[in-house]
Every structure is written in C-alpha cells, then in structure tokens.
Amino acid sequence: GALEVQVPEDPVVALVGTDATLCCSFSPEPGFSLAQLNLIWQLTDTKQLVHSFAEGQDQGSAYANRTALFPDLLAQGNASLRLQRVRVADEGSFTCFVSIRDFGSAAVSLQVAAPYSKPSMTLEPNKDLRPGDTVTITCSSYQGYPEAEVFWQDGQGVPLTGNVTTSQMANEQGLFDVHSILRVVLGANGTYSCLVRNPVLQQDAHSSVTITPQRSPTGAVEVQVPEDPVVALVGTDATLRCSFSPEPGFSLAQLNLIWQLTDTKQLVHSFTEGRDQGSAYANRTALFPDLLAQGNASLRLQRVRVADEGSFTCFVSIRDFGSAAVSLQVAAPYSKPSMTLEPNKDLRPGDTVTITCSSYRGYPEAEVFWQDGQGVPLTGNVTTSQMANEQGLFDVHSVLRVVLGANGTYSCLVRNPVLQQDAHGSVTITGQPMTFPPEA
C-alpha cells in the first residue's frame, strides 16, 4: 500500500531568528537502506524545492542554504527538516514527500511569530494639564508578528473602547509596529493601561500611564522625568524622557542641557551656547532639536545594549537650575524553550530521565518554573543555570531529573521578569518502551 508519512497536526510555531524543526516521519521496513530513499521537501503552494535526499545522498538545501536534514536519523524513518534563522517570509505550508518503493506525502504548517516589545506610552499635550483637558495617549509596541490585538482599560480595569485608533505598520523585516491612540478627557487624575497581545504566542505586553493634572511650582527649574524605569529591548532605540517648562520669551541661547550617567558622572550628551554639542556616548545619542524650545529635553539612545542599563541624569540650567534622574532597564525576550531528554530511547516506567529546558538570548536573568501534566509545580531535582553570551544576554538551561511514571507531561516555563513575557515548552512521555522525540 501507500507509504504512511506522519507530520504534526498543529502548526509549528517558530520565533523569528530562531531555528525550527518541521517534523516528518515514515516507518522503514526491515532491510531498508538509504539508497532506496527519495525524500523531497517543498513549499506546498508554489512547489518550490526546499531540500532533497536522493540516490543515497543529501542533495542539500535549495532554500537559501538555511535547511538541513537529520542524516543520522534518516535510516530510522526521521525525515524532519531543520529550518535555520526563521524569517517572516518562511511562514506557510511545507510538504514532505517520501518515496521508497511506495510513495507518501504530508504537509506541515509553519507559523512564524515574534514577541512585541513592552509598550511605550506618550502623552500629548504633556504639560500644564488640568481636569477637563483632552489628551491623546499613544501606546506603541514594536517588532512583533503576527499583527497584535490591543486593549485599553482605566485604573479600575474597565475596558476603554471608544476614541481608540489602532494602526499596524510593517517595518523593513515585515515585523509589525503597533500604534494605538486613545483620546480621553482628564478627570482629577487617572490611570490608563494599554495591553498588546500576540495572538500566536499568547504573549501580553503592557504599560500604563498615570496622569495627575497639576500646576508647576515656581522657583527652581522643575525637571520632569518618568518615575518608572524606561524599558528598552536590546537593539531597539529608547527615549529617556525629560522635560522642563520654558517661561515666556525663553530662547535656546539661554539653555544649558547636560545628560550624564548618574553614577560615574560620565558625559552622555549636551546642548550649550545655543548648539547641540553632540553625543559623547559612542555616537548613539540624539536630542529632539525641534522640540527643545517647547521644553522637551528628552534623549534618544540608539541600538540599546545591555551595558546601557542604569541611571541617566538630565541637568537643565536656564537662569535657574534643576535635575532629575531616569532609569533605563534593558530587556530582551527569551526564545521558545527547546526540550531535550536523556536517555531518549527505550524508556520504561521507573527509568530516571534528565529533561533539559533551554531558552536563549534573554535579559535580564529568567525565572524558570517546572510543572507536571496536572499543573503541579515540580521543584525538587531542578538545577537552573544562566550563561551570559558575548552581548551580555543570557541563555538559561534548566535541568529536571524525574522518575518516569506510565506516562507524563513535563512543562517548563521561562519568564522574563521585566517584560512579563512567558515562554513555555513541554514534553509528553507516553507508552513503553518509547523513543524520544516522538516529534523531532
């Protein structure tokens, strides 16, 4: 009869930039040799060749040199395909064709995803606000995929659905920046929260702004910065907000503005003698020159690195003098955990196995939680290690040792405490004897 080719029913979800395995397996008959095997992976819709194995040899990748088979596992019927450095454009259906004497095929879907950054909130106008004023609050979250869902609520948790305009702008990589604009009339004070949800990753990123309308006191220059740390994703640009209230007749010639590192007093950027004196911080900073006259002394920090984390002080001197410090909290989302099992063949109830859960390139250090199929936390026999790479990002490896029951599911959840981003992986060990992975 026809050859039975097996692939997962559910789409394979892969984070942009990570590697994905498109599982495909067949059952080789006794005496099967690779010389008999013809294996073709192709794009289901366009029939474009992706990778092939024929005449006993891996014919290599026909897909931007980013695919590989598992040569050591082919003889056991594992025809899975490894797709490296996943891109948005890879999303879609891949067909696995296997021919020995008989022939069979099956299609597996790849769903690409990318987590959204912690939303940044901007307020306009942002000075001299009084109850009854109408303000525009913009919630922006960057570099996610697929399109996000955005939800607003007030301080009491009541959804705000009126006067909201949400736009999705695709960037150069085809990832989405989402911008949601809420218009509200201010009460005596109020908190407005924006939640950006990635529907595929079930990842929620949220931010809120509390507005307390008030008059500025007179006297020294009042310099205002956000109370909460500014959270910035590694590689993105961050705005360290700082504002002052210029008096009537104020001109930029009167302004002395200095940004420096709070702890070391290292100069970061300055504006003096009516001129932007430029960046003293690796040429990665900029002011907003068109906005300075309106009292916006904010600093743009480009291509944020882990080493940028810390406190920055904004000094403003006109006739009077004032300063305030803003904290920069750097973050990077953790990849979807990969799970490995050792030993991974001929497992029986009573065997002790080591399950390793690995998640990569996050910051700051992750929290890792294990639980069984019933949701019961597993805390014993867990060793979690965090390894920093060249950029100071962390790879987290958590090792769980368990004695197998008749069957069992073991889940690992990797939490980024700053982004409140949860990434999880699980493995189900069923039957006896069995071989892992049932899905490569």
Epitope: T122, T166, H179
Partner: antibody, heavy 117, light 111 residues
Framework: EVKLVESGGGLVQPGGSLKLSCAAS????????MSWVRQTPEKRLEWVAS???????YYPDSMKGRFTISRDNARNILYLQMSSLKSEDTAMYYC???????????WGQGTLVTVSA | DIVLTQSPASLAVSLGQRATISCRAS??????????MHWYQQKPGQPPKLLIY???NLESGVPARFSGSGSGTDFTLNIHPVEEEDAATYYC?????????FGGGTKLEIK
C-alpha cells in the same frame, strides 16, 4: 467632511530647503497616523514619510536625513521639512491620512515643489 | 524593496464591459491574516482616491462595480460594468514592509 489642504510648495534651487504644511479639518487629527506621498512629473507615486506622534516617524531610506515629518496636534497641522533638495525631488506633494494598515484613505489636493537652477 | 508591476500599462474597454488590471509583487505581501495590497483611482488634475484596501475591501462610498482579489504576489482589480466616469489611471500599493511602494499605474480608456 475630511479636508486636507497643503501649502508651502514652490520653486527652489538644488541644495535648498523648503517646509510644506498641511492643514487638516473634519476629523480628530491627533488620533490618526498622517503621511506625505509625492507624485513625480512622470506620474510615479512615492511614499515619503509617516508620523504617529512627535517622536515616532517612518521614512524610506532614500528620504531619511533629508526630510523630517512633524505635526502640531494643537493646531491640526502636518509638516514636511525638506533640505538638500535635488532635481529628482521635483513632484506634487500630497498630504494623506493613513488607514490602520498603512493605506492612504484621504488625500489633499497637493502642493507642487520644483527643484531647478 | 518590494517592486509592484502593473499590467497592462494602458487598456481600452467598451462601456458596460469588464476591465481587469493586474498587479504583481516581487515577493509576497500577504500573511495568514491579510493581504496588504490597496488600489487607488486618479483622474487628471485630482489626487488619488482609495478604492480597495487589504486586497478586497471596498472603501466606503466606492461603487460596487469595483472589486479586488488576490493573495501572495498576484492581485487583480476588476471593474464591471465599466462606466464613462471610470476613465482614469489606477495604482496598486503595498504596505507589507517598509518602504511602502506603488505600482507604475494603468491608464483606463473607455471606448
């Protein structure tokens, strides 16, 4: 009724600067992403810039550095500051209100910019 | 950059007949959720006017004789039955990734 009225176009020498304005009415200006699109004498349409809020802007690489889009939500005005102008910047410049997936839902009548010695 | 190629560059269609304009993208402008292709009509001396957004959605106020279809790289604007006032140049535009680009235009004449 949504109305967009551009102004500020004219004749400018190569290397010169010009600031275009677009007065918006008939909708809540601050709630929408606004854009500039230009049309060359050969009738080719080119996206120039988009702005979400004062510090969130988008440009094609070819316009970055030379063109700056800004907005004044209090006065319902969109701006395009153009510098280091070249002859190939000669075009009709349209102000447009963007839709939620970066299409251009409403257009002004345009203002003509001619860069010539 | 994604290049949009429109064809034909011009066409003449008899009153009441069907006009079909094609727009081909150099790479896919679709995701599993949407196709990020939009269509505009421009008459001499006027700005472009949005007809269709996200490949197949008719903009408010646009007559139902205009329709859009397609996904991936191939998209079509259909006008049926063609009326006198449809004489214009039609442009496609994508918003799948930066920079957003337009097709070169198709000029429709009514016979």
């Amino acid at each position: 009724e949504v109305k967009l009225v551009e102004s500020g176009g004219g004749l400018v020498q190569p290397g010169g600067s010009l600031k275009l304005s677009c007065a918006a009415s008939g909708f809540t200006f601050s709630s929408y992403i606004m854009s500039w699109v230009r049309q060359t004498p050969e009738k080719r349409l080119e996206w120039v810039a988009s702005i979400v809020s004062s510090n969130i802007t988008y440009y094609p690489d070819s316009m970055k550095g030379r063109f700056t889009i800004s907005r004044d939500n209090a006065r319902n005005i969109l701006y395009l500051q153009m510098s280091s102008l070249k002859s190939e910047d000669t075009a009709m410049y349209y102000c447009a209100r963007s839709g939620t997936r970066a299409w251009f839902a409403y257009w002004g009548q345009g203002t003509l910019v001619t860069v010539s010695a | 950059d994604i290049v949009l190629t429109q064809s034909p560059a011009s066409l003449a269609v008899s009153l009441g007949q069907r006009a079909t304009i094609s727009c081909r993208a150099s790479k896919s402008v679709s995701t599993s959720a949407y196709s990020y292709m939009h269509w505009y009509q421009q008459k001499p001396g006027q700005p472009p006017k949005l007809l269709i957004y996200l490949a197949s959605n008719l903009e408010s106020g646009v007559p139902a004789r205009f329709s859009g279809s397609g996904s991936g790289t191939d998209f079509t604007l259909n006008i049926h039955p063609v009326e006198e006032e449809d004489a214009a140049t039609y442009y496609c535009q994508h918003s799948r990734e930066l920079p957003y680009t337009f097709g070169g235009g198709t000029k429709l004449e009514i016979k």
